[in-house]
């Protein structure tokens, strides 16, 4: 319960206080008042900072003293020793004694009294907008003639709103213009005009001068007008900053002017008027306005005729004209209506390319279709560029209505493969080097993705599985990385008729023929890891010479493993059929002599022992493309071979070009039209 | 380098429990199934439970099935081995390893090519 | 489950002699076998994998043969940190069972 004085005494007092003592006081007068706080006897034992005894005297988070040793007087006639005056109606009051005492020391006694504060004068922040009056434990605000204090009792502002009007014509100012504004104030004028008419405001740029805006561009006191969802404005500072000329297209305006507590200037005079509302020469496109005028308003009549090759396609179809009125709103009557061209519509999506979102659909407007690059090209011509037709179609120059065709680019890898030395004697490779790589898990091989729908990989590899499960994307071919990877589902093999179907195939010695071809069940989406690898070509340029090199892949046997986890490739020279029949098999199965080497097989390797090997079956032997450096072909499939890091066969892809395409176009999948 | 390191051994009373982990370092844990072999006090190596690379399958040796529990939080890198009702019977060394797979519907095997120095559990009364 | 029965249990062998350690199963389990070294106080250390396959990093003294039932662990010529236990190890199917090793002492 505050109180307007009182006592305070150390333990003990006037007797010696006791050690390891922490007592305190919380001093409370009542709100308006401020505490006088002063001792008549202090004597505590002396110490740097006062740090072992102590009274302390705390004000909310500041302390206002710490006291020790022994005072007296200095004024004979009182017996103050030590006095603090707080303007708060809170203090505390904190004794401290350590665990011992040198001497016998007596503590302290301290009174407090309540005392007035000058609310008015005794703060840095005024709280007062005008007149503050101070009086014994509070304060009250008061303001100048014609200014009424506001619900805060503490601002002063004028009352200036309220004030609407409704004649055609008319002069608003700020209140006492031209003389200084009141501040603090907010002012609210409505100009209501009948319908069919809007507000033009109009004003001179010397009738305008308001307190500036800060150094942000926020205006200290505004101006603004407001027309429905349009605002004009905020406006301030010397001479009006915005249009002379305000047409607000609204029949209701409202004017705020709005002030702060400092920074008075004469304000602002304006003039409004009424104008019959317009409506805007609008172009509509296609079509003809009688009466053609340099200016339409309120309650004019208009009839608007389509062109040849228009018509009104909403409300009465196939009319070629309607009328309009311009309305009290400031809009045409039957606005929807137009005479509009003919609309071609959304154009048809098409597979692996896009067609950006077009501006307009409508005659002559274009359209451009682009392939997903890198990974399709346009294959049937055409630009892909369309233009809407007069009979509601897209055309294209070339194609007609036809749509363009996006397939994949062949033999483009997107990372080149650069060989790192470790497929045998081989190096770590990226799927992105042979995006066309296909891995196979039933028996471990690989194959060559050529198109969206085929694999191409070695009869050897799917001739005692007919239902492969193959994968691409992915370098690793651990479980974990293909379970995450892209499975492709076989729809049917097709085996080459030559190819020897034998009933032990572990005893082969023939692997002429050594090609099939897999139809996926669905289309391969291509990208970064996964893209076609081409076909060769039937000319000349074709033919393989000895030295030419060749790009081989797989996770097929290694120096280090019986299967590779990450793929593996190699770089390796076309050799002689000789070198190939030269080395020694393995582990033959038959008589050497049995083995069968013929013109569709290619021979390659026998370079620092890098060769494909087991597990690698079916994978592409990359070629560089002679007409086209950029892209790589399969000239061979890895199909067998004497011994792991000598020379390989391979199967030889230009001898079986006819038979692959006569397969491919015999079982595709009819275009969906 | 491929470092397998396990922790959580410690000596239990019968019916008690004990969950072992084993953190893994220096190789993709979430491409690789996990295993646990234990070897008692003299004997031979024993099979206890094993993993695959996303834990939704998972194998027991009879002599532990339904007390013992595998489990792998590949966030964490880490493999556990969850041991309830223990028996003096289990008290061995029990080592994590590392297994590898191969394939995506026909799978290839390569089990415990990397080994932790194991952890050591005694089930005593 | 598999058994896999490993002989002999233990051997005598001198620096330099040919080693042959077999392991025999219950039932056909293709070649997914392999075999673990084990030396006092240490962790197993995988040797061959799918029957005949050297761990990269192996001496190529050792070689493993075998497919089905019958499995042989082969050291062509016995070195001194090669006297370790042996154990074989099937993985054809849950659970995977390991022999019982084979101890190659010093003659």
């Known amino acids: 319960e505050p109180t307007m004085y009182g006592e305070i005494l150390s333990p003990n007092y006037p007797q010696a206080y006791p050690s390891e003592v922490e007592k305190s006081w919380d001093i409370e007068v009542p709100e308006g008042y401020g505490i006088h706080l002063y001792f008549t006897h202090l004597d505590i034992e002396l110490s740097e900072n006062c740090a072992y005894d102590s009274v302390q005297i705390i004000s909310g988070d500041t302390e206002e003293g710490r006291l020790c040793g022994q005072r007296s007087s200095n004024n004979p006639h009182s017996p103050i020793v030590e006095e603090f005056q707080v303007p708060y109606n809170k203090l505390q009051v904190i004794f401290k004694s350590d665990f011992s005492n040198e001497e016998r020391f007596t503590g302290f006694a301290a009174y407090y009294v309540a005392t007035d504060i000058n609310e008015c004068t005794d703060f840095v922040d005024v709280p007062c907008s005008h007149f503050c009056n101070n009086f014994i434990g509070g304060y009250f605000c008061s303001c100048p003639p014609e200014y009424f204090l506001h619900d805060d009792m503490k601002n002063c502002g004028v009352n200036c709103s309220g004030d609407v009007f409704t004649a055609l014509i008319g002069e608003i100012a700020s209140p006492n213009y031209p003389k200084p504004y009141p501040e603090n104030s907010r002012c609210e004028y409505q100009i209501r005009l009948e319908k069919g008419f809007q507000v033009v405001v109009t004003l001179r740029r010397e009738d305008f001068d308001v307190e500036a805006a800060d150094s942000a561009g926020n205006c200290l006191d505004s101006l603004v007008f407001v027309a429905g969802d349009r605002q004009f404005g905020p406006y301030c500072g010397h001479g009006f900053p915005g249009p002379l000329n305000i047409e607000t297209k609204s029949n209701a305006l409202d004017i705020i002017f709005q002030t702060d507590l400092t920074g008075q200037k004469k304000g602002w005079k304006l003039r409004y008027h009424g104008d019959p509302m317009p409506c805007p020469k609008e172009d509509t496109p296609n079509s003809v306005w009688e009466p053609a005028k340099a200016k339409y308003v309120f309650r004019d009549v208009v009839q608007i005729t389509c062109l040849d090759g228009f018509e009104v396609v909403e409300g009465r179809v196939g009319a070629t004209s309607f009328y309009s009125t311009c309305q009290s709103n400031g809009k045409w009557s039957n606005s929807k209506l137009k005479c509009q061209p003919v609309d071609c519509g959304i154009p048809e999506s098409i597979e692996n390319g896009k067609v950006e979102d077009p501006e307009s659909t409508l005659f002559g407007s274009v359209i451009r279709y682009t392939c997903e690059e890198p990974y399709y090209y346009m294959e049937n011509g055409g630009g892909g560029e369309y233009h809407c037709a007069g009979n509601g179609s897209w055309v294209n120059e070339v194609l007609g209505p036809e749509l363009p065709k996006c397939v994949p680019v062949c033999g483009v890898p997107r990372e080149p493969f650069e060989e790192k030395q470790r497929i045998i004697g081989g190096s770590d490779a990226d799927i992105k080097n042979f995006p066309w790589q296909v891995f196979f898990d039933n028996p471990w091989a690989g194959g060559a993705l050529i198109n969206e729908y085929w694999v191409l990989t070695a009869a050897h590899v799917v001739e005692g599985n007919r239902e492969p499960t193959m994968y691409v994307g992915s370098t690793s071919v651990q479980t974990s990385r293909l379970a995450k990877s892209k499975m492709l589902t076989p729809e049917h093999v097709f085996i080459h008729p030559g190819w020897k179907l034998l009933e032990v195939p572990e005893g082969r010695t023939n692997f002429d023929n050594d090609i099939a071809l897999v139809r996926l069940k669905d289309p391969v989406k291509m990208g970064p890891t996964v893209s076609p690898i081409c076909l060769p070509g039937t000319s000349s340029d074709y033919n393989l010479m000895d030295g030419d090199l060749g790009l081989i892949s797989g996770w097929g046997r290694t120096e280090k493993r019986d299967r590779a986890v990450r793929l593996k490739a190699a770089r390796l020279p076309v050799a002689p059929l000789r070198k190939c029949k030269e080395v020694k098999v393995e582990k033959p199965t038959a008589d050497a002599e049995a083995y069968v080497f013929t013109p569709n097989m290619i021979c390659a390797g026998g370079e620092k022992g890098m060769d494909s090997c087991k597990g690698d079956s079916g994978g592409a032997f990359a070629v560089q493309d002679p007409n086209d450096k950029t892209k790589f072909y399969a000239a061979g499939l890895v199909s067998w071979g004497p011994q792991c890091g000598t020379y390989g066969l391979y199967t030889r892809v230009k001898n079986y070009v006819d038979w692959i395409m006569k397969t491919m176009q015999e079982n595709s999948t009819p275009r969906e039209d | 380098q491929v470092q397998l390191v396990e922790s959580g051994g410690g000596v239990v009373r019968p019916g008690g429990s004990l969950r072992l982990s084993c953190a893994a370092s220096?190789?993709?844990?979430?491409?690789?199934?996990m295993s646990w072999v234990r070897q008692a006090p003299g004997k031979g190596l024993e099979w206890v439970s094993g993993?695959?690379?996303?834990?939704?399958?998972?194998g027991y040796a009879d002599s532990v099935k339904g007390r013992f529990t595998i489990s792998r939080d590949n966030a964490k890198n880490s493999l556990y081995l969850q041991m309830n009702s223990l028996r003096a019977e289990d008290t061995a060394l029990y080592y994590c390893a590392r297994d590898e797979q191969l394939g995506g519907q026909t799978y290839y095997y390569y089990y415990m090519d990397v080994w932790g120095k194991g952890t050591t559990v005694t089930v005593s009364s | 489950d598999i058994q896999m029965t490993q002989s002999p249990s233990s051997l005598s062998a001198s620096v330099g002699d040919r080693v042959t350690i077999t392991c025999r199963a219950s039932?056909?389990?293709?070649?997914?076998l392999g075999w673990y070294q084990q030396k006092p106080g240490k962790a197993p250390k995988r040797l061959i994998y799918t029957a005949s396959n050297l761990q990269s990093g192996v001496p190529s003294r050792f070689s493993g043969s075998g497919s089905g039932t019958e499995f042989t662990l082969t050291i062509s010529s016995l070195q001194p940190e090669d006297f370790a236990t042996y154990y074989c190890l099937q993985y054809n199917q849950v659970p995977l069972t390991f022999g019982g090793g084979t101890k190659v002492e010093i003659k």
């Open positions: 039932q056909g389990i293709r070649n997914d």
């Open positions: 220096g190789f993709t844990f979430d491409d690789y199934g």
């Open positions: 993993i695959n690379w996303e834990g939704g399958s998972t």
